[in-house]
């Protein structure tokens, strides 16, 4: 059920998956949001505590019933993830934040006129997550005008601290406000030797773009197809960067793809969500239900339809066997990071994807069709 | 594969599971050979860094492949399981450690002769699973003959100190030296209401008794049969104990069950491996693999003989649709407990745990029919 | 959201009598063990008294003869009439649905299925 009322001064016991740094409790709702597994947050805001670097804590949780209890907390706000809600979801977050500091990796610094321009380049910066401009109030007058771009590992900040002068936000290439190249074309037969950030299985090299824009740091990606000679490797799409934000190692080997992440890009395709079906194909995870349902559709509507399903596996029933009930049987799935744990076929499973995230499209979309 | 050798100065790098102290690189090989996930370990010894508090260190560890990249590090001692090998296990562990403390609630002092009248005090109580006992040499002439029982939640100590002076060691009630109580009785139409250590998922009282014995704090249980009222708790084991080692609290409700943790038995059944198939029963977890064999009992030998599977569900092939192979569809699993997340019915399929845990059993029932 | 409220709590001097409440929402009484616990500073989380859905009650040796386990189901409410209250009934008194036992001796942990109130301390001088 969605509820979209946040809860003052009050905390969600236990369940926690993480905690990350937010500069609100709409912020930590839309991580919360995009998390693959979380379903309730705890924001704690600004003098919830004695201990400042508690501040600003985006505590993200779970729980199997989809319900914790909550417990009184002064200064905590708490609420539930969009993905149980109809309603379309942006990652787009245009807000700026007055006298936050959102620390990161400072790794470029320059003068700029106003905020909008630091904003600006951060958004035309391909590594760039956020930023802190220090105004023209900034009590350090040598460090006035200042534009910090940084990045972390997760994509929000390490910590939030209260510093006078300074403002700070967020890149806007999920609004689809970059300016940077867009390059849309899948590579066959092409290895990409640069560093890997992180790696998760998917059934085709679309996925694994899909996956790879939505990462936090991907920036172009490697993919092993089901025909890569070295079985453990199949299926297994490298998510990538390089300091210069280009790759600077291509190998030629077959039954290899390789391709860039489309964060740069104003989508009129859906880079979040992963509606085909994949035929023959078991997708293995962990398990949620296991439902009756006639036909595949239905069986991504019912993943679709529960708040914590991932991803699924549909067995047709067999015609001959039982003509009078053409119902199959259909294996609700999830994992710690939203993918399948592995990809198997030749066992008669069709697999697929929830469609939760396909909200997040149309949105980006519409926002973007007018430009 | 089965590795006894053990690896000086080598650590396996990554694939933490858990981190937890013990006496000796021996005590930790048999922490990670009975913790559902564990498949490697690095154990720290002593000198092993600058910091005495990692020394004793045992870092528990998995790994889809079973196999870790191996780093040098001077002090570690790294290891396999024996999970992956043939021979007879036991929880039994009859060392002294000299000059070590071992941490935990110390919640029972007494005056003793010596070391091996405490490791018996220890086995006699009910709480009790490891001791310290300062000896004749102990610098404080008040403490001498002290013998302090200890207790944590894990069952290890929270940490281990170089002591002069001092004799740790284990409780023996897995060795079937415990004269307390053998309460084998299991209690219809009963729910005991004392303090919840843990809730696993369980598809009998048996084997809810067997993961109560398992459990290092487990000393009652009550389990919520198929036919419990409370959809969301059927099939719920909820591990009790209280401060004074016996249930203060019987309600009687029906479709519940209550008994006792069998830690204190001498055992001439198994009571840490579940045989018993589950017809028309589905276990839910984290998958594993699928593989196509004959009958319910290869699927078990298959889940045996794989490392990091703990249960699994078979469906057998539907004999008028395919009289010619007549081979099921085997699902081999595994949870972060090793029980399943969820147990359902009437979906055909036929289910049971894997069988490694009776080569600990055996030795069990050996080692005490002599008495 | 399952939410358990109490009221009732307050002050009282020994001999003295309170009625605790304890309201559902989103959450029907009819096919619920209901159950009162308690939690004294530093002590352990421990049950007071059950209502069983079947009708049964139960009561802690302590409060035996004292306190009076009841509920409205119409109203979705269960009570506790406190009685000849003592110094020791002095703590926060926990309402719980479905919940055998508390967790880690806290009276707000629960497995599936279990639900705890926010507690309503009840204070008794001598």
């Known amino acids: 059920e969605c509820v979209t009322k946040v809860f003052k001064d009050i905390s969600f016991q236990g369940g926690d998956l993480s905690t990350v740094f937010t500069p609100s409790a709409t912020y930590c709702r839309l991580v919360c949001t995009h998390h693959p597994r979380c379903l309730l947050f705890t924001f704690m805001a600004e003098s919830s505590s004695d201990d400042p670097t508690k501040w600003f804590a985006c505590i993200l949780k779970d729980s199997v019933t989809e319900i914790l209890p909550m417990v009184n907390m002064t200064g905590a706000i708490s609420g539930y993830s969009f993905k149980q809600c109809p309603q379309q979801l942006s990652t787009c977050s245009k807000d700026v934040y007055v006298n936050l500091d959102m620390k990161g990796m400072n790794y470029n610094s320059s003068v700029v006129k106003n905020a909008r321009e630091c904003q600006e380049r951060c958004t035309d910066d391909a590594h760039c997550q956020f930023f802190t401009y220090a105004t023209g109030y900034f009590p350090s007058v040598d460090h006035r005008k200042m534009c910090l771009l940084k990045y972390t590992r997760t994509g929000t900040p390490t910590t939030i601290t209260k510093l006078n002068g300074v403002v700070s936000g967020f890149s806007l290439k999920s609004c689809g406000l970059s300016n940077l190249a867009c390059i849309r074309d899948i590579f066959p037969n092409t290895v990409l030797a640069d560093l890997n950030i992180d790696s998760v299985v998917a059934p085709d090299a679309f996925v694994c773009r899909r996956i790879c824009t939505h990462h936090p740091t991907c920036l172009f990606f490697t993919f092993f197809s089901q025909a890569w000679p070295k079985e453990s490797q199949r299926h297994l799409c490298l998510l990538k960067t390089s300091e210069s934000g280009l790759p600077s190692t291509r190998i030629t080997k077959s039954h290899a793809l390789s391709g860039f992440s489309l964060q740069h890009c104003r989508h009129s395709v859906p880079v979040f969500c992963h509606p085909s079906f994949y035929n023959d194909t078991d997708f293995l995870g962990e398990e949620l239900d296991i439902v009756d349902v006639k036909g595949q559709e239905t069986c991504q509507k019912t993943c679709t339809n529960n708040a914590r399903c991932q991803f699924f596996t549909y067995y047709p029933s067999h015609r001959l066997c039982n003509e009078r009930n053409r119902r199959g049987r259909c294996y609700l799935k999830l994992s710690s990071n939203g993918s399948p744990t592995r990809i198997l076929h030749g066992r008669g499973g069709i697999s697929g994807y929830s469609l939760r995230l396909c909200k997040m499209d149309n949105v980006c979309t519409t926002k973007i069709n007018p430009r | 594969e089965c590795v006894t050798k053990v690896f000086k100065d080598i650590s396996f790098q990554g694939g933490d599971l858990s981190t937890v102290f013990t006496p000796s690189a021996t005590y930790c090989r048999l922490v990670c050979t009975h913790h559902p996930r564990c498949l490697l370990f690095t154990f720290m010894a002593e000198s092993s860094s600058d910091d005495p508090t990692k020394w004793f260190a045992c870092i528990l560890k998995d790994s889809v492949t079973e196999i870790l990249p191996m780093v040098n590090m001077t002090g570690a001692i790294s290891g396999y399981s024996f999970k992956q090998c043939p021979q007879q296990l036991s929880t039994c562990s009859k060392d002294v450690y000299v000059n070590l403390d071992m941490k935990g609630m110390n919640y029972n002092s007494s005056v003793v002769k010596n070391a091996r009248e405490c490791q018996e005090r220890c086995t006699d109580d009910a709480h009790c699973q490891f001791f310290t006992y300062a000896t004749g040499y102990f610098p404080s002439v008040d403490h001498r003959k002290m013998c302090l029982l200890k207790y944590t939640r894990t069952g290890t100590p929270t940490t281990i100190t170089k002591l002069n002076g001092v004799v740790s060691g284990f409780s023996l009630k897995s060795c079937g030296l415990s004269n307390l109580a053998c309460i084998r009785d299991i209690f219809p139409n009963t729910v005991l209401a004392d303090l919840n250590i843990d809730s696993v998922v369980a598809p009998d009282a048996f084997v809810c008794r067997r993961i109560c014995t398992h459990h290092p704090t487990c000393l009652f249980f009550t389990f919520f049969s198929q036919a419990w009222p409370k959809e969301s708790q059927r099939h719920l084991c909820l591990l009790k104990t209280s401060e004074s080692g016996l249930p203060s609290t019987r309600i009687t409700k029906s479709h519940a069950l209550s008994g006792f943790s069998l830690q204190h038995c001498r055992h001439s059944v198994p009571v840490f491996c579940h045989p018993s198939f589950y017809n028309d029963t589905d276990f839910l977890g984290e998958e594993l693999d699928i593989v196509d064999v004959k009958g319910q009992e290869t699927c078990q030998k298959t889940c045996t003989n794989n490392a990091r599977c703990q249960f699994f569900t078979y469906y057998p092939s539907h004999r008028l649709c395919n009289e010619r192979n007549r081979r099921g569809r085997c699902y081999l699993k595994l949870s972060s407990n090793g029980s399943p997340t969820r147990i359902l019915h009437g979906r055909g399929g036929i289910s049971g745990y894997s069988l490694r845990l009776c080569k600990m059993d055996n030795v069990c029932t050996t080692k005490i029919n002599p008495r | 959201q399952v939410q358990l409220q109490e009221s009732g709590g307050g002050s009282v001097q020994a001999g003295g009598s309170l009625r605790l409440s304890c309201t559902a929402s989103e959450f029907t009484f009819d096919d619920s063990d209901m159950a009162w616990y308690r939690q004294a500073p530093g002590n352990e989380c421990e049950l007071v008294s059950t209502i069983t859905s079947d009708g049964g009650t139960y009561y802690a040796d302590s409060v035996k003869g004292r306190f009076t386990i009841s509920q409205d189901n119409a109203k979705n409410t269960m009570y506790l009439q406190m009685n000849n209250l003592k110094p020791e009934d002095t703590a926060v008194y926990y309402c719980?649905?479905?919940?055998?036992?508390?967790?880690?001796?806290?009276?707000?942990?629960?497995?599936?299925?279990?639900?705890w109130g926010q507690g309503t301390q009840v204070t008794v001088s001598s």
């Open positions: 719980a649905a479905d919940q055998w036992g508390s967790a880690e001796g806290d009276c707000t942990s629960s497995y599936p299925g279990g639900y």
